[in-house]
């Protein structure tokens, strides 16, 4: 019973997890404009992996894709390479273990296949869930070298006279989204994994023996026994996981059509 | 077509408050902000603030801080100005914009003359 | 707050004529972002509240005459007219739209000879 639910409970924390790294790729807030200490601007910038925004006092917000893959800047690109490893291995594992889940029947699949395949999905989360961290880690450790970059010549001038104000970027409510939706894919895949040591049928065989009895000539020979995992054929009050998790989309909503910046 | 009526002029003396409204037709109100606009007489343009139609957010310049406020009556498509405790200083012509792209203020009321007199 | 300094004050110019004032702000109104310079252009007649010319620096209004050209970048920024009409005597006015307050230039008065 505990193996089942912590199967179905790794699973659902799993989707949850993998549906929080779909919605923060997909995010366009990786990073934000820095309000902090700037003049005040009617106008915010905000960029994704994909696409860089500008939203302005008025209402009018304007987003633009990086349609080059050349000039794109190699920690980006591998950023998103590792998102998309970590969404593929995510997926992957998903369908795996949902063929592995003790509360499934498909045909007459023996638990040691279970037990594997609960384990194969199990390491997918946890790569994708380091996939995502990773990325997300990544960008962030991008961010902060170039707020402090942009911080050290915050302010260029021509004499001193004109001023030219340098946007800094801070951390993005994706990078949220990424390092908590990675951890809860990892924290699932450790639970699979777990999952799968109570799954795996352990063969405790012993010996036959032969008791030899006065009179009579009747061996009782013990057949090799299972280890009691506590799930037997008995399939009478079976606890059923549907793991119907409700995925949130994670992505933001502003608070008005123009917001005030 | 898109019009801003804005309301009469005014006359006033000084201390007392005076509140000029702004009614918007031809444009969804809450999807634009709505921005005001001071001039005195044979003056430039001075920026008072905007207010945000959907969340009725305001902000006002640092010149117009305390005496000058904002609202929305987004039933009646309507934004106002009220200005209190009145100085001749505020004798002018008040316009009400709509700020649109490029934080551009595209459309403009015809003005409401507030004179200060006592 | 940002300054806004137009120039110059006043034009005196015949029909026909091309014209050039200038607007200069204290800060860099181009946004890194979408490499927008957020000034914005409006002519304002005797009477009347003003209108607006372009924004976005040099993108046009609908319905203005393409007569009417905004450039520059940064700091420095320039409306022009190729041809002057009579009904283009009025005062030109250049606004920050990219830090609060959305200050105003002082103007540019145009007038015919």
């Known amino acids: 019973m505990a193996v089942t639910a912590c199967q179905g409970l790794g699973f659902v924390v799993s989707l949850i997890g993998i549906a929080g790294i779909i919605a923060a790729t997909c995010m366009d807030q990786w990073s934000t404009q820095d309000l902090y200490n700037n003049p005040v601007t009617a106008v915010f910038n905000y960029q994704g992996l994909w696409r860089s925004c500008v939203r302005e006092s008025s209402g009018f917000t304007e987003c633009r894709g990086y349609f080059t893959l050349l000039g794109l800047p190699a920690m980006l690109q591998a950023v998103r390479a590792l998102m998309i490893v970590g969404i593929v291995l995510g997926a992957i594992g998903l369908l795996v273990s949902i063929f592995a889940l003790k509360c499934i029947r498909i045909g007459s699949m023996e638990d040691s296949a279970k037990a594997n395949m609960t384990l194969t999905s199990g390491i997918m989360f946890i790569v994708s869930g380091l996939c995502a961290i990773a990325g997300v880690s990544v960008f962030a450790n991008m961010l902060v070298t170039n707020f402090w970059m942009s911080t050290a010549n915050m302010y260029t001038g021509m004499g001193g006279m004109v001023q030219t104000v340098q946007t800094r970027y801070t951390f993005g409510a994706a990078l949220f989204v990424g390092w908590v939706a990675g951890g809860l894919t990892l924290i699932g895949g450790v639970m699979m994994c777990i999952a799968c040591r109570g799954l795996a049928p352990e063969e405790t065989n012993y010996k036959a023996v032969s008791y030899h009895a006065s009179g009579h000539s009747v061996a009782y020979k013990p057949g090799g026994f299972k280890a009691s995992t506590g799930f037997g054929s008995n399939t009478k009050n079976k606890k059923i996981y549907d793991g119907g998790a409700r995925t949130e989309d994670e992505v933001q909503s502003y608070p008005s059509k123009h917001d005030y910046v | 077509q898109i019009q801003l009526v804005q309301s009469g002029p005014e006359l006033r003396k000084p201390g007392e408050t005076v509140k000029i409204s702004c009614k918007a037709s031809g444009f969804p109100f809450t999807t634009d902000g709505m921005s005001w606009v001071k001039q005195a007489p044979g003056k430039g343009l001075k920026w008072m603030g905007w207010i945000n139609t959907y969340s009725g957010v305001p902000t006002y310049a640092d010149d117009f801080k305390g005496r000058v406020a904002f609202s929305l009556e987004t039933s009646a498509s309507t934004a106002y100005l009220q200005i209190k405790n009145l100085k001749n200083e505020d004798t002018a012509t008040y316009f009400c914009?709509?700020?649109?792209?490029?934080?551009?203020?595209?459309?403009w009321g015809q003005g409401t003359s507030v004179t200060v007199s006592s | 707050d940002i300054v806004m300094t137009q120039s110059p004050s006043s034009l005196t110019v015949t029909a026909g004529e091309k014209v050039t004032m200038s607007c200069k702000s204290s800060q860099s109104l181009l946004n890194s972002g979408n490499q927008k310079n957020y000034l914005t252009w409006y002519q304002q007649k005797p009477g009347q509240p003003p209108k607006l010319l372009i924004y976005?620096?040099?993108t046009r209004e609908s319905g203005v005459p393409d007569r009417f050209t905004g450039s520059g970048s940064g700091t420095d920024f320039t409306l022009t007219i190729s041809s002057v009409q009579a009904e283009d005597l009025a005062i030109y006015y250049c606004?920050?739209?990219?830090?609060?307050?959305?200050?105003f230039g002082a103007g540019t008065r145009l007038e015919l000879k």
């Open positions: 976005w620096a040099s």
């Open positions: 914009a709509r700020f649109r792209r490029g934080n551009a203020l595209d459309n």
């Open positions: 606004q920050n739209n990219y830090f609060y307050p959305l200050t």
